[in-house]
C-alpha cells in the first residue's frame, strides 16, 4: 500500500520544508485514496471481465451511490463553496457503507482496501474542520447501512463482482469531482 | 463438460454423523461457489449453504446452522457436507449445486445422495 | 429472504396444447440487467433438471418447446406443444442472493 500523506520519507528527510496548508492536505488525501482505488480496480479487472461491462448494464443497478449533479454546486456553472462541501461530506459519508463492503473482496490487495477506507474517514475529519454549516450534513442510519451490507453480501458471485466494480468507478468518479471542486475554493 | 459427482446413498442410525461427498471435474474449482440442497420425499427444496472453495469461505441457512458442516479439498476438487446429530428430519436427498456466472455460466446440479435415517 | 410464489400447484393439459406456470418474486431478482430466475423439472427418483436459466436462457439439451420470460418480479415458464414426457414438477428458483429460495412446485400432467 502506498505510504498515507504526512508519513512519506521525504516529510522526515526535510524539516524545514513549509507545513501543508489545509487545503494542500485534502488536496494529497484525495490523490492518495485515488491511487489506492487504481490498485483495486486493476485487481478487479485482471479478476473477471467486469471492466469491459457496458454503460447500460452498469445503469441496471438499485445501488443508491453518491453522484454530483447541478443542484450539488460542485460544477464551476453555478459553483456554490458551502453547498458543494457540504454535498462532498455527505457523499464521502454515504459511501462509507460501500467501503466496508469491499473489504473482503480482494485477495491480493486487502491491505489496499483497507488503505482506502481507512483514508476515506481521516479526508471526512479533515473536510469537516473546513465545513462552518455542518449541521447541513446528513449522517446516513447505522441500521439501513447494516441491513445494506447484508444485502449486498448475500449477492450472488457476479452480482458480488459487478458491485464491487461499480462501487470502485462511482467513487473514483466522485473523487475527482471533489478534488476539481475543491481545488477551486 | 461440468460434472458433480456425488457419494453413494447412507443409511445411518439416530445420533449419528454422516459425512457425504461432492466430487467436481470439468471447471477450476477454485472460481465457482458450491451450495448444498436439502429435499424431504415429496416435498420442495431448501437451501443449506454455501462454501467458496477458494478460501473456504462459508455461509449458513439459520436453520442449518449447527447441523451442517460444509468442507473442500482442494487438491481432490472435493466438496463434503457432515450432518450431526441426525433424526429422522434429516432423512432426505442432498444435493450440491455449483453457482453459475452472470448469463455466462449456468448452474450445475449433483445427482443427489439420500440419507436415511432410522434406528 | 425472497420469497417466491408458484403457481398453478396442478395443472393438465392436453398433448399438443400449451402449458403455463407462473411465478412471482416478492422482490426483484434483477441485477446489472440480468434476471436471476431458474426453472427446474423434476421427475420422480430423479434429480432436478435445469431447463432455464437467468430467466430466458435454455439448459443444455432442453428442447425449444420450453420457453421462459419476465423480468423483476414477475416470471413464466411455456411448455408448447406439451408432450408425454413433459409430465412432471416444476419448480422456480431465484439465485440472485442467499437464502437460494424456490417456488412450491407446480404438479404438471397430461389431460
Known amino acids: 500500500a502506498p505510504v498515507p500523506p504526512g508519513e512519506d520519507s521525504k516529510d522526515v528527510a526535510a524539516p524545514h520544508r513549509q507545513p501543508l496548508t489545509s487545503s494542500e492536505r485534502i488536496d494529497k488525501q484525495i490523490r492518495y485514496i485515488l491511487d489506492g482505488i487504481s490498485a483495486l480496480r486493476k485487481e478487479t479487472c485482471n479478476k473477471s471481465n467486469m471492466c469491459e461491462s457496458s454503460k447500460e448494464a452498469l445503469a441496471e443497478n438499485n445501488l443508491n451511490l453518491p453522484k454530483m449533479a447541478e443542484k450539488d454546486g460542485c460544477f464551476q456553472s453555478g459553483f456554490n463553496e458551502e453547498t458543494c462541501l457540504v454535498k462532498i461530506i455527505t457523499g464521502l459519508l454515504e459511501f462509507e457503507v460501500y467501503l466496508e463492503y469491499l473489504q473482503n473482496r480482494f485477495e491480493s490487495s486487502e491491505e489496499q482496501a483497507r488503505a482506502v477506507q481507512m483514508s476515506t474517514k481521516v479526508l471526512i475529519q479533515f473536510l469537516q474542520k473546513k465545513a462552518k454549516n455542518l449541521d447541513a450534513i446528513t449522517t446516513p442510519d447505522p441500521t439501513t447501512n447494516a441491513s445494506l451490507l447484508t444485502k449486498l453480501q448475500a449477492q450472488n458471485q457476479w452480482l458480488q463482482d459487478m458491485t464491487t466494480h461499480l462501487i470502485l468507478r462511482s467513487f473514483k468518479e466522485f473523487l475527482q469531482s471533489s478534488l476539481r471542486a475543491l481545488r477551486q475554493m | 463438460e461440468v460434472q458433480l459427482q456425488q457419494s453413494g446413498p447412507e443409511l445411518v442410525k439416530p445420533g449419528a454423523s454422516v459425512k457425504m461427498s461432492c466430487k467436481a471435474s470439468?471447471?477450476?474449482?477454485?472460481?465457482?461457489?458450491m451450495h448444498w440442497v436439502k429435499q424431504k420425499p415429496g416435498q420442495g427444496l431448501e437451501w443449506i449453504g454455501y462454501?467458496?472453495?477458494?478460501?473456504?469461505?462459508?455461509k449458513y441457512n439459520e436453520k442449518f446452522k449447527g447441523k451442517a458442516t460444509l468442507t473442500s479439498d482442494k487438491s481432490s476438487s472435493t466438496a463434503y457436507m457432515e450432518l450431526s446429530s441426525l433424526t429422522s428430519e434429516d432423512s432426505a436427498v442432498y444435493y450440491c449445486?455449483?453457482?453459475?456466472?452472470?448469463?455466462?455460466?449456468?448452474?450445475?446440479w449433483g445427482q443427489g445422495t439420500s440419507v436415511t435415517v432410522s434406528s | 429472504d425472497i420469497v417466491l410464489t408458484q403457481s398453478p400447484a396442478s395443472l393438465a393439459v392436453s398433448l399438443g396444447q400449451r402449458a403455463t406456470i407462473s411465478c412471482r418474486a416478492s422482490?426483484?431478482?434483477?441485477?446489472?440487467?440480468?434476471?436471476?430466475m431458474n426453472w427446474f423439472q423434476q421427475k420422480p427418483g430423479q434429480p432436478p433438471k435445469l431447463l432455464i436459466y437467468?430467466?430466458?436462457n435454455q439448459g443444455s439439451g432442453v428442447p425449444a418447446r420450453f420457453r421462459g420470460r419476465g423480468r423483476g418480479t414477475r416470471f413464466s415458464l411455456n411448455i408448447h406443444p406439451m408432450e408425454e414426457d413433459d409430465s412432471a414438477m416444476y419448480f422456480c428458483?431465484?439465485?440472485?442472493?442467499?437464502?437460494?429460495?424456490f417456488g412450491g412446485g407446480t404438479k404438471l400432467e397430461i389431460k
Open positions: 449445486a455449483r453457482e453459475g456466472y452472470g448469463n455466462l455460466e449456468r448452474d450445475c
Open positions: 470439468g471447471y477450476t474449482f477454485t472460481s465457482y461457489v
Open positions: 462454501i467458496n472453495p477458494y478460501n473456504d469461505g462459508t
Open positions: 422482490e426483484s431478482v434483477d441485477g446489472f440487467g440480468i434476471s436471476f
Open positions: 437467468v430467466a430466458s
Open positions: 428458483q431465484q439465485s440472485k442472493e442467499v437464502p437460494w429460495t
